[in-house]
Interface confidence: low
């Protein structure tokens, strides 16, 4: 079955700057600002557009080793980024894949809202643990906060 999970996270960073850093340059920036979570992101095929495959290696102390993601859509004009987790111990034995649709929208006061809509594709009739879905959201939030902190400390970058 398919289990949906939606989350919204407020950010003080304007949408365009956040998309440019967190999404478009995330492969380089995230391991730099959150080394305690992600140790490396390696592009193993593609130019960053749809079809690109990335290997993400988690840091020591994180209960997962690696994840393989496929880029499904990149919409620079509307700050949309869709990708699918297709491999990795994060999926366990009950999940076939997890598809994420990320959209960053402008918010009052100059900030933005990061909206994530996730579809957890379970194998057969397996249920998806709510904790697993919540855990994915919390990890994404940690990475977002780290990127925000970096952007505030380095005001000249990603403008």
């Amino acid at each position: 079955g398919v289990f949906n999970y939606e989350a919204e996270t407020p950010s003080v960073i304007p949408a365009a700057r956040l998309f440019k850093s967190y999404v478009l340059d995330g492969d380089k920036l995230i391991p730099k600002v959150a080394p305690q979570v992600i140790s490396s992101v390696e592009n193993v095929g593609g130019n960053g557009g749809p079809g690109t495959i990335k290997n993400i290696t988690f840091a020591e102390g994180i209960p997962f080793k690696f994840v393989k993601e496929r880029v499904d859509e990149v919409d620079n004009a509307n700050f949309k980024y869709n990708y699918t987790v297709i491999e990795g111990d994060v999926l366990g034995d009950k999940l076939e894949k997890v598809s994420h649709e990320l959209k960053i929208v402008a918010a009052p006061g100059g900030g933005s809202i990061v909206k994530i809509s996730s579809k957890f594709h379970a194998k057969g009739y397996h249920e998806v643990n709510a904790e697993k879905m919540k855990g994915a959201k919390e990890m994404a939030e940690k990475l977002l906060r780290a990127v925000e902190s970096y952007l505030l400390a380095h005001t000249a970058e990603y403008n």
């Epitope: 600002v33 305690q36 009052p108 006061g109 100059g110 902190s149 505030l152 400390a153």
Partner: antibody
Framework: EVQLVESGGGLVQPGGSLRLSCTAS????????MSWVRQAPGKGLEWVSN????????NYVESVKGRFTISRDNAKNSLYLQINSLRGEDTAVYYC??????????????????WGQGTTVTVSS | DIVMTQSPLSLPVTPGEPASISCRSS???????????LDWYLQKPGQSPQLLIY???NRASGVPDRFSGSGSGTEFTLKISRVEAEDVGIYYC?????????FGGGTKVEIK
Amino acid sequence: EVQLVESGGGLVQPGGSLRLSCTASGFMSSMYWMSWVRQAPGKGLEWVSNIKQDGTEKNYVESVKGRFTISRDNAKNSLYLQINSLRGEDTAVYYCARDLYSSSSGYYYYGLDVWGQGTTVTVSS
Amino acid sequence: DIVMTQSPLSLPVTPGEPASISCRSSQSLLHSNKYNYLDWYLQKPGQSPQLLIYLSSNRASGVPDRFSGSGSGTEFTLKISRVEAEDVGIYYCMQALHTPLTFGGGTKVEIK
């Protein structure tokens, strides 16, 4: 693991000085404002001071102005609090905390989200 | 300085039952960006404080969803939908709109 570890506390006579240190691990403290918060024995929490990422902006509670100085060494991932002219009412556990506050942006605030275990300062003759 | 006032001072609770703590500020904590700069912290016995809620209603990472924050302006509330034994400790509200940041006096939550 993201953590903060304080040190430098101890027993000091009134009028004396101490330098408290706070070392961050698991994250780059240079990306964050940092705060000191204290708690007198059996009392509530009192925010003491905070410092901007690059050290250019510092804030203090009125009762410590002119006696306490906050500073940081980003290369060492460390935060400091120099406390001079100590008084009995400065006796407390001193906590450092990661402070996601930024007065310059106005909007950026996500709470004091990581705290150390605290270091105890006792002022007594 | 902004003065924060919490009530009650002490709150005896029964596990499984709801609980509510109020916090009032001496001036509005509503920023022009529409966010209320009000946090809730829990200090468990013998431990450092931990962040529960920031900007009035946003749960911090890892905080169980039985905790919720609400309110705007000068009146704020922390609710625990079903109290668990591990929730005992002292709860503090804190304003972060202006320095000096200021805390409420605390509410001690204990099991009946």
